[in-house]
């Protein structure tokens, strides 16, 4: 994302198709209050940012309200009247969906169905990752809606789960961000647990009849 005009690195994140965050890192201007000027596609005049992000007392970014906008953001980062970085970007390329909300687990024998509230826009993947203390790495399953069924689980094992949302690359391109993970929740025998033991508990001895 970051062009290196006059040593300025930028990052754009479009939070949940609601708010655009543009941040900059300009070592040459580290003690300067750079200003951010922008317009959306089709608008004539540039507006100045009204919601700056500050780092060590100096401007380091801007937050813009941009509800479900599928167009180009034109912006200029300036030192006084002098532009130090000017660019235009398709905002949706930098989509970061919000973290899954209202995550629920429905158990039936050796399977669990994980559901959450679908976001209001489409072309997303809802990914569930899970593991037991016996697993060396996370297992993953994803679906187009937040209704993911994982089968073949061992009812005796404790499993940790978390969920996130990703934008489909074919639709939004390769530069999007996955959502933050939901909180980890732990389950064993269909019941929620505070945590899964880090070291696997040895299997119970089978009682001979």
């Amino acid at each position: 994302q970051g062009g290196a005009a006059e040593g300025v690195q930028i990052q754009i994140i479009y939070f949940n198709l609601e708010t655009v965050q543009v941040t900059w890192n300009a070592s040459k201007y580290s003690r300067t209050n750079l200003t951010f000027h922008y317009r959306f596609n089709g608008d004539e005049a540039y507006d100045q940012c009204t919601n700056y992000l500050l780092q060590e007392g100096h401007t380091s970014g801007c937050l813009l309200d941009a509800e479900q906008r599928d167009d180009i953001l034109y912006f200029s980062i300036r030192n006084g009247t002098h532009p130090v970085f000017t660019a235009s970007r398709w905002m949706v390329y930098y989509l970061k969906p919000s973290s899954p909300k209202h995550v629920r687990f429905s158990w039936h024998q050796d399977a669990v169905t994980v559901t959450c509230s679908d976001l209001s826009y489409g072309d997303l993947l809802y990914e569930v990752q899970y593991r037991s203390p016996f697993d060396t790495e996370w297992q993953s399953k994803q679906e187009n809606t937040c209704n993911v069924t994982i089968e073949g689980l061992d009812a005796e094992k404790c499993y940790s789960f978390w969920v996130r949302v990703k934008a489909m690359e074919d639709v939004y391109g390769p530069d999007t961000y996955p959502s933050d993970w939901s909180e980890v929740t732990c389950w064993q025998r269909g019941e929620i647990r505070d945590a899964c033991a880090e070291t696997p508990t040895p299997p119970k001895p089978k009682l001979s009849k």
Partner: antibody, heavy 119, light 106 residues
Framework: EVQLQQSGPELVKPRASVKISCKAS????????IHWVKQSHVKSLEWIGR????????IYNPNFKDKASLTVDKSSSTAFMEVHSLTSEDSAVYYC????????????WGQGTTLTVSS | EIVLTQSPATLSVTPGDSVSLSCRAS??????LHWYHQKSHESPRLLIK???QSISGIPSRFSGSGSGTDFTLSINSVETEDFGMYFC????????FGAGTKLELK
Amino acid sequence: EVQLQQSGPELVKPRASVKISCKASGYSFTGYYIHWVKQSHVKSLEWIGRINPYNGATIYNPNFKDKASLTVDKSSSTAFMEVHSLTSEDSAVYYCARSYGYVNYFDYWGQGTTLTVSS
Amino acid sequence: EIVLTQSPATLSVTPGDSVSLSCRASQSISNNLHWYHQKSHESPRLLIKFGFQSISGIPSRFSGSGSGTDFTLSINSVETEDFGMYFCQQTNSWLTFGAGTKLELK
């Protein structure tokens, strides 16, 4: 089979306007953006803008904002581009093309419409 | 405006040769770079998307590489149907194309 069928060649006088059509078939018209591209010997390929057939929302290349107008007719699955205040510099081949999602690369193109501006 | 510079302007080759075409962006465009082939009196056809991703129905002799500002389209063993113009397109900002590379018969 996906097809974008464009209207035929146009010979138009300077200062007039012209409207070029692009009829889509073989796919859901409202599910893909329609873009317009100008090809001339002077400047190779130039993106003019795009329209969302679902809601008619347009985005233009700033260089063409006052030169072209994009519209659609959903009932006939047809996109239109009107080019205004024609000069000899507008003489070119104009293509419509479609893209899926927000990614803006073109997987299908029309056959092109040749526009000649001459008195 | 992001300017795309293609080189060489013309490439003269014999069928069976392998070639590389260059596209350089005036600023970083991540992987938002796509390649098209246009035969004489025809419409362009998409070859590669996002720098390196293949397109269904496009022969495997076409491949793409690069990221940021420097991109390459490679054709492994050129066939006669490959002659024509090759254009790169960036979609990072409002869309622009390179001036093209003409691949011609030596």
